[in-house]
């Protein structure tokens, strides 16, 4: 069998095969040793018994999307049946005091590979043997502690494969310089040691994406905005836009990045090299926000200009592109190509509560039967739209441990002046957070208040 017969996936074009688009990967035209690495189709009954105590699940993730030319990293994590884990020696053991369907196990090992490898023969003293090889026959690399690595991972995409010996978790990075743009499929087959052969235990695949557009994400934050994810914001308060460029392999680390903003409110274009920007909308309505990110990234070098024409006519050699030497690249050339990323959003701007202030606090006269309680009136003003609810959160002086939260609807006139009465049980210092809210906004103010001891002899008391 060949690799492509075993790993059901895409194949490379002739161009890609010649250019070996994944550095360090091999063509799936290579032979696969099916005696050592048996191949089971989906639905084959043997999968049921490929692992003691249940099925192993492989989880494949990547840091996709990847800007073409950058590295993309794939991670595979094995999830073992309940009560099983990998120990420091790479053996699979039962967790202590863990009960599964079979109850507690007397044997601490699910798979004791250390014992197997000590028993193994046919080695030539270097740890090399006919079975310490990958599916294509290449020998295992002898890193320190390689004997504790008991899983073989075969990654396959775009007609190429990569083999890796590992523990229950592995990572593989791939350069995407010559990878086709668009969604692609990565498939991974995982084998475990089984005596002098290997047994498939899991297969997993995942879509990854290579793009020539910079992956851009924008977060938007505005003080007093009730819901930051609904793209509805408040008039007359700055919105902070923060641009995150998804570049996990730091491909653009040495690039100058320019951000070109159009806020859709006839304020023109704003160009910056800073990933954050503040903008205030002064009118209500719906606005189209557009961001273009530009970065000079490492990229392919253009072909050199054709040589100057000789003065005497010479026989034609065909198109310039037919000469393979003319298209060759100097590997160390550092050419730059402008890459662009785009973000677009429709933003709705509405009236909101812009500000809230406590302008007065008054101790309320209390009758004798409630000597431990103090009633305090907070006189509050606000700016912007009219609030429909008020909440007070009373907490300790550090404002961290909440003691009491009360919310109630309010009916406020256009002057936006209201009195909020709250009870304080006992003397001491309190932190009071007071918020005024409506459908779209939530404005907060805080104050520390000191409630003095009540004099039980005094029927009434007025505090500052």
């Amino acid at each position: 069998k060949r690799f492509h017969d075993v790993l059901g996936n895409e194949r490379p074009s002739a161009y890609m095969r010649e250019h070996n688009q994944l550095n360090g990967w091999s063509s799936d035209e290579n032979d696969w040793n099916e005696k050592l690495y048996p191949v089971w189709k989906r639905g084959d009954m043997r999968w049921k018994n490929s692992w003691k105590g249940g099925r192993v699940q492989a989880v494949l993730t990547s840091d996709s999307p990847a800007l073409v030319g950058s590295n993309i990293t794939f991670a595979v994590n094995l999830i073992f049946p309940r009560c099983q884990k990998e120990d420091a020696n790479g053996n699979i053991v039962y967790e202590k005091n863990c009960r599964n369907e079979a109850g507690l196990s007397a044997d601490p090992y699910v798979y004791n590979w250390t014992a197997w490898s000590e028993d193994s023969d046919g080695e030539n003293g270097t740890g090399q043997s006919h079975h310490n090889v990958f599916p294509d026959g290449k020998p295992f690399p002898h890193h320190p502690g390689w004997r504790r690595w008991n899983f073989i991972y075969v990654f396959h995409t775009l007609g190429q494969y990569f083999q890796k010996l590992g523990r229950c978790s592995v990572r593989v990075s791939v350069n995407t310089a010559n990878v086709t743009l668009g969604p692609q499929l990565m498939e991974v087959t995982v084998y475990r040691r089984h005596g002098r052969a290997y047994v498939p235990i899991a297969q997993v695949k995942d879509v990854y994406v290579v793009t020539d557009q910079i992956p851009v994400f924008v977060t938007m934050f505005q003080k007093n905005d009730r819901n930051s994810s609904d793209e509805t914001f408040l008039k007359d308060l700055p919105i902070m836009f923060d641009v995150l460029i998804h570049d996990p392999s730091h491909f653009l680390n040495y690039s100058t990045i320019n951000y070109k903003w159009s806020f859709g409110d006839n304020t023109g274009l704003f160009v910056s090299t800073n990933h954050t920007v503040n903008h205030t909308y002064v009118l209500n309505g719906t606005f189209s926000l557009n961001l273009t990110v530009k970065a000079a990234a490492p990229g392919p070098c253009p072909p050199p200009p054709p040589p100057p024409r000789p003065s005497k006519p010479t026989p034609s050699l065909g198109p310039a592109g037919d000469n393979p030497l003319e298209l060759s690249r100097i590997p160390d050339e550092n050419c730059q190509i402008n890459r662009y990323g785009h973000f677009q959003a429709t933003i709705t701007i509405v009236e909101g509560i812009l500000e809230v202030n406590i302008i007065q606090m008054t101790d309320v006269l209390m009758p004798v039967p409630w000597p431990e309680s103090s009633l305090i009136d907070f006189v509050v003003t606000c700016q912007g739209s009219i609030p429909t609810e008020v909440c007070t959160i009373i907490s300790d002086p550090t404002c961290e441990i909440t003691q009491n939260t009360v919310c109630s609807p309010v009916d406020v006139d256009e002057m936006c002046l209201l009195t909020v009465r709250r009870t304080f049980n006992g003397s001491g210092t309190y932190c009071v957070n007071l918020t005024l809210g409506d459908d779209t906004s939530l404005a907060l103010t805080s104050t520390l208040i000191s409630v003095p001891d009540r004099d039980p002899a005094s029927p009434l008391r007025m505090a500052n």
Partner: antibody, heavy 115, light 107 residues
Framework: QVQLVQSGAEVKKPGASVKVSCKAS????????MNWVRQAPGQGLEWIGA????????EYNQKFKDRAIMTADKSTSTVYMELSSLRSEDTAVYYC????????WGQGTTVTVSS | DIQMTQSPSSLSASVGDRVTITCKAS??????VAWFQQKPGKAPKALIY???YRYSGVPDRFSGSGSGTDFTLTISSLQPEDFATYFC?????????FGGGTKLEIK
């Protein structure tokens, strides 16, 4: 440039079978999956399945699992989709589309099922 | 199967208008969504992959956004050649499924 050229229109009777072909050129045939999608008159798109010409690995929409067979011929860079037990509701334009999510499409083959 | 619900099913607009088409998946499809344009009697043409990335040659007035279950195709300023039917597709899991389509007509 990439081209997918499909076979000509077909008229079939209910219960019969039809085999539609899609010949690929402009790229190496075994590189990409080939999807089959159909579109009934005035309707939307419906995914039938996909085949990997490299090893004839297939994925089918369960709705067509028992009636559709996709095959690939590497020697001619052609994929085929055969649909059996035809009924009137199979009247549609059948498209092939290259890649995991199609980036290039064939021109379409009209299949009419009528008694 | 994952259902892709596209809205509106039809839309009248004028040249220069900004148009938004939405697609809602019945379950999470991450960003594994593509958008296609189809003109009468023609095969679909791929516009967008992975929810927001344009295929080469697609004008930048076309933009896609969304993740999870809610996706949007926006045409920022309609051109005469943009009047067509638009489809979304999820390729997160088999069977791949398409939205019902949005027919964009001249007002």
């Amino acid at each position: 440039q990439v081209q997918l050229v499909q076979s000509g229109a077909e008229v079939k009777k209910p219960g019969a079978s039809v085999k539609v072909s899609c010949k690929a050129s402009g790229y190496t045939f075994t590189t990409y999956w080939m999807n089959w999608v159909r579109q009934a008159p005035g309707q939307g798109l419906e995914w039938i399945g996909a085949i990997n010409p490299s090893n004839d690995y297939t994925e089918y929409n369960q709705k067509f699992k028992d009636r559709a067979i996709m095959t690939a011929d590497k020697s001619t860079s052609t994929v085929y989709m055969e649909l059996s037990s035809l009924r009137s509701e199979d009247t549609a334009v059948y498209y092939c589309g290259r890649s995991y999510s199609p980036d290039y499409w064939g021109q379409g083959t009209t299949v009419t099922v009528s008694s | 199967d994952i259902q892709m619900t596209q809205s509106p099913s039809s839309l009248s607009a004028s040249v220069g208008d900004r148009v938004t088409i939405t697609c809602k998946a019945s379950q999470n499809v991450d960003n594994h969504v593509a958008w296609f344009q189809q003109k009468p009697g023609k095969a679909p043409k791929a516009l967008i992959y992975s929810a927001s990335y344009r295929y080469s040659g697609v004008p930048d007035r076309f933009s896609g956004s969304g993740s999870g279950t809610d996706f949007t195709l926006t045409i920022s300023s309609l051109q005469p050649e943009d009047f067509a039917t638009y489809f979304c597709q999820q390729y997160k899991s088999y069977p791949f499924t398409f939205g019902g389509g949005t027919k964009l007509e001249i007002k």
